[in-house]
């Protein structure tokens, strides 16, 4: 059967005016899943994300991530898509540096 | 297919409110944005606004938003536009609009309009 | 706000001719935040031209896109029937979200 993923958004300070926005998607299987940023629910082109590779976790799962760099004070307008064997859900970015998202989806 | 049917035709006097529907099919209507644009007789489309159903995140456009509301209810479907304190400068086609995954909007209701009158 | 300007307002050419539209942005844009749409009478917009030069689905050959920074353009190498229409370009770089006024291609 098919694992659904943990999905953690983050962000740290990349450089003034500018912070990075990091969505990472753990703990599932299959292995096929599609992780991108949204500006206003469209899709960042390609060259504005930066992406890992999918890896195993070392317990029969897979784990992934996404990133972008975005102007501070438009982390509304953000969002991290996952799509993973046909469920999708969509992240905001948190408000703040300590704020994490955690979320399971089934 | 995907499809965006709105509501019919309104006739509203000023000051009255008025609340157009939006019903999605053909898609997973959680996966995109809803966006909201009008366009006044002969005159360029206007954006209003849009909703992400997953998650219940709104954005106005700030000139809009002390009169409208935007609203969706998942288990239909269904994307609102509420708006309120009728002008008639408000007169107008209201379009709904999905959000495609390389531009704001790839497909649109039928449009719906609205006319206020007294 | 960034505000989208067309030129002309209104172009009168002939079936088989070249059309050129224009798009000129009163802020730099990055090219994956400019599309263009068609709009008929009586009818909802539909997209045409996505991050300045892509086709849309379903969308013939005879259109194409180009720019970069605060100017970009429309073409429409030979003229058909059913091109004879208004044209909207459109910004989704930063909020709020605009259009431009619209070009109206009519037949001369």
């Known amino acids: 059967g098919s694992v659904p993923p943990m999905v953690n958004v983050t962000r740290s300070e990349a450089s003034e005016g500018n912070i990075t926005v990091t969505c990472r998607a753990s703990s599932f299987y299959p292995r096929n899943i599609t992780l991108t940023w949204r500006q206003d629910g469209v899709s960042l082109s390609h060259d504005t994300q930066q992406w890992g590779d999918v890896l195993p976790d070392g317990n029969g799962t897979y784990q992934t991530w996404v990133a972008t760099r975005i102007c501070q004070g438009e982390e509304q307008r953000f969002t991290c898509y996952m799509e993973h064997s046909g469920n999708h859900s969509t992240h905001p970015v948190p408000s703040g540096n300590s704020h994490h998202h955690h979320h399971h989806h089934h | 297919e995907v499809q965006l049917v709105q509501s019919g035709a309104e006739v509203k006097k000023p000051g009255a409110s008025v609340k157009v529907s939006c019903k999605a099919s053909g898609y997973a209507f959680t996966s995109n944005n809803i966006y909201w644009v009008r366009q006044a007789p002969g005159q360029g489309l206007e954006w209003i606004g849009y909703i992400d159903p997953y998650i219940g995140r709104i954005i106005y456009n700030q000139q809009f938003k002390d009169r409208v509301t935007i609203t969706a209810d998942t288990s239909t479907s269904t994307a609102y536009l509420e708006l309120s304190s009728l002008r008639s400068e408000d007169t107008a086609v209201y379009y709904c609009?999905?959000?495609?995954?390389?531009?704001?909007?790839?497909?649109w209701g039928q449009g719906t309009l609205v006319t206020v009158s007294s | 706000e960034i505000v989208l300007t067309q030129s002309p307002a209104t172009l009168s050419l002939s079936p088989g001719e070249r059309a050129t539209l224009s798009c000129s942005a009163s802020s730099s844009i990055s090219s994956n935040y400019l599309h263009w749409y068609q709009q008929k009478p009586g009818q909802a917009p539909r997209l045409l031209i996505y991050?300045?030069?892509n086709l849309a689905s379903g969308i013939p050959a005879r259109f194409s896109g180009s720019g970069s920074g605060t100017d970009f353009t429309l073409t429409i190498s030979s003229l058909e029937p059913e091109d004879f229409a208004v044209y909207y370009c459109?910004?989704?770089?930063?909020?709020?979200?605009?259009f431009g006024q619209g070009t109206k291609v009519e037949i001369k």
């Open positions: 459109q910004q989704g770089g930063s909020l709020p979200l605009t």
């Open positions: 609009s999905r959000s495609g995954e390389r531009s704001n909007f790839d497909y």
């Open positions: 991050r300045t030069s």
